[in-house]
């Protein structure tokens, strides 16, 4: 049994780090492999992650952490029974992928404005809470070329756009993702998308 692509891990900087790797051939990850992880700190336990399959040769493991601070470092050992396949380490603060924003809602009750709101995925006591900026993707369901990204660089998880900038009588979808500038993170996954119908009509059309 051989590791083809060594484990790479990303942390949500809260309670979960996700490690992925590829094996040299088809593998039943949960039956054949174990990823052991231990915080490098006095009296910390060695925990065992049972991986799950991620495609034919891919495996994924979720490492559980109570909290994350910048100096945390974990040792990682990938085992197949009594055989050590790979040994490495992982510093969560250097490989951050934020959680996806949630509760994306579209408010169209103000006649000439579309208001999008969403929730910050972190609690106020988390370091990332005040460091997130967002990208909102809006697209026309019937015309994928009619798609735009709005960068939200302020802290408040809201975006206002003039309804007039969208085509009238068309269904649109929106989704949002986040990143944290000071932690040099990757982008989060996109939030689930939400759909609305743009019923706005310009004044001259209504005459």
């Amino acid at each position: 049994m051989k590791v083809l692509q060594e484990p790479t891990c990303v942390s949500d900087y809260m309670s979960i780090s996700t490690c992925e790797w590829k094996m040299g051939g088809p593998t039943n990850c949960s039956a054949e492999l174990r990823l052991l992880y231990q915080l490098v700190f006095q009296s910390s336990e060695t925990h065992t992650c049972v991986p799950e399959n991620n495609g034919g040769v891919g495996c994924v493991c979720h490492l559980l952490m109570d909290d994350v601070v910048s100096m945390d470092n974990y040792t990682l050992d990938l085992w197949a029974g009594q055989q050590l396949l790979w040994k490495g380490s992982f510093k969560p603060s250097e490989h951050v992928k934020p959680r996806a924003p949630g509760n994306l809602t579209v408010h169209t009750n103000v006649s000439d404005t579309v208001l999008l709101t969403w929730s910050n995925p972190y609690p106020p006591d988390n370091y990332l809470y005040n460091d997130l900026t967002y990208a909102v993707n809006i697209w026309n369901e019937n015309d994928l070329a009619d798609s735009r990204i709005h960068n939200v660089t302020y802290l408040k998880p809201t975006l206002r756009i003039p309804a007039s900038t969208l085509k009238s009588g068309i269904s649109y979808r929106a989704r949002v993702r986040a990143w944290a500038q000071h932690y040099n993170t990757t982008w989060s996954e996109w939030s689930p998308s939400t759909k609305w119908y743009n019923s706005y009509r310009e004044p001259f059309e209504q005459r």
């Epitope: 309670s15 979960i16 949960s30 052991l36 915080l39 700190f41 006095q42 009296s43 910390s44 336990e45 060695t46 925990h47 065992t48 992650c49 049972v50 799950e52 979720h62 559980l64 952490m65 109570d66 909290d67 994350v68 601070v69 945390d72 009594q82």
Partner: antibody, heavy 128, light 108 residues
């Protein structure tokens, strides 16, 4: 210094209740773990009672014999309790608090599997 | 799950090689730990995951096995090793942590 300190032990009458406490100190706040209770009757072996996850999930596991009469709860990630009800003479023992490692599959299935560090124990005597 | 530990007691001399076995009633992979306990004291972790030495434990202690059969070996018994030893088996399929009955090691 890394340590676990139990308290709340003492003498109680049969049918009575007692709540034991365990306070942890000296650990990294980052380290996910279970907090568990194990007991040892005089001159007998060790017996696992149950565990509670110290993180936000707070999931609990119990030995089959302990379900119902024994309840493990937590005030925080560093303070846990063992509530014991309807006590019997055979519950007389030294009760130990212990930190445990775990096995996890995904983020919702987490099972405690070895006790890495133990407190000094607190004595419980059930007698009339 | 049941953990059958043997022998229940043994007498040995300083310098002896001592072996204690533990048998699980079902496959527990490598989820087995060994503990040492001295009178009036809390148990101390020696070995986890069947063969991994806990921090600060002397290298004369070693563990082996997987599945259902496990062994704790003390390669050269020292005066401070006279104590009671317990195995702990963990079955995540049945959701239980069970200690063996213990092995008391005394001076011959």
């Amino acid at each position: 210094e890394v340590q676990l300190v139990e308290s709340g032990g003492g003498r109680v009458q049969p049918g009575g209740s007692l709540r034991l406490s365990c306070a942890a100190s000296g650990f990294s706040s980052s380290s996910a773990h279970y907090m568990c209770w194990v007991r040892q009757a005089p001159g007998k072996g060790l017996e696992w009672i149950g565990c509670i996850y110290a993180g936000s999930r707070g999931s609990t596991y119990y030995a089959s014999w302990a379900k119902g009469r024994f309840t493990i709860s937590k005030a925080s990630s560093t303070t846990v309790y063992l509530q014991m009800n309807s006590l019997r003479a055979e519950d007389t023992a030294t009760y130990y608090c212990a930190r445990a490692a775990f096995v996890n599959r995904g983020v919702s299935w987490i099972w405690p599997y070895y006790f890495s560090l133990w407190g000094q124990g607190t004595q419980v005597t059930v007698s009339s | 799950i049941q953990m059958t530990q043997s022998p229940s007691s043994l007498s040995a001399s300083v310098g002896d090689r001592v072996t204690i076995t533990c048998q699980a009633s079902e496959d527990i992979e490598s989820y087995l730990a060994w503990y040492q306990q001295k009178p009036g004291k809390a148990p101390k972790l020696l070995i986890y995951r069947a063969s991994t030495l806990a921090y600060g434990v002397p290298s004369r202690f070693s563990g082996s096995g997987s599945g259902t059969d496990f062994t704790l070996t003390i390669s050269s018994l020292q005066p401070e090793d006279f104590a009671t030893y317990y195995c702990l088996g963990s079955s995540y399929s049945t959701g239980s942590n069970i200690f063996g009955t213990g092995t008391k090691v005394t001076v011959l």
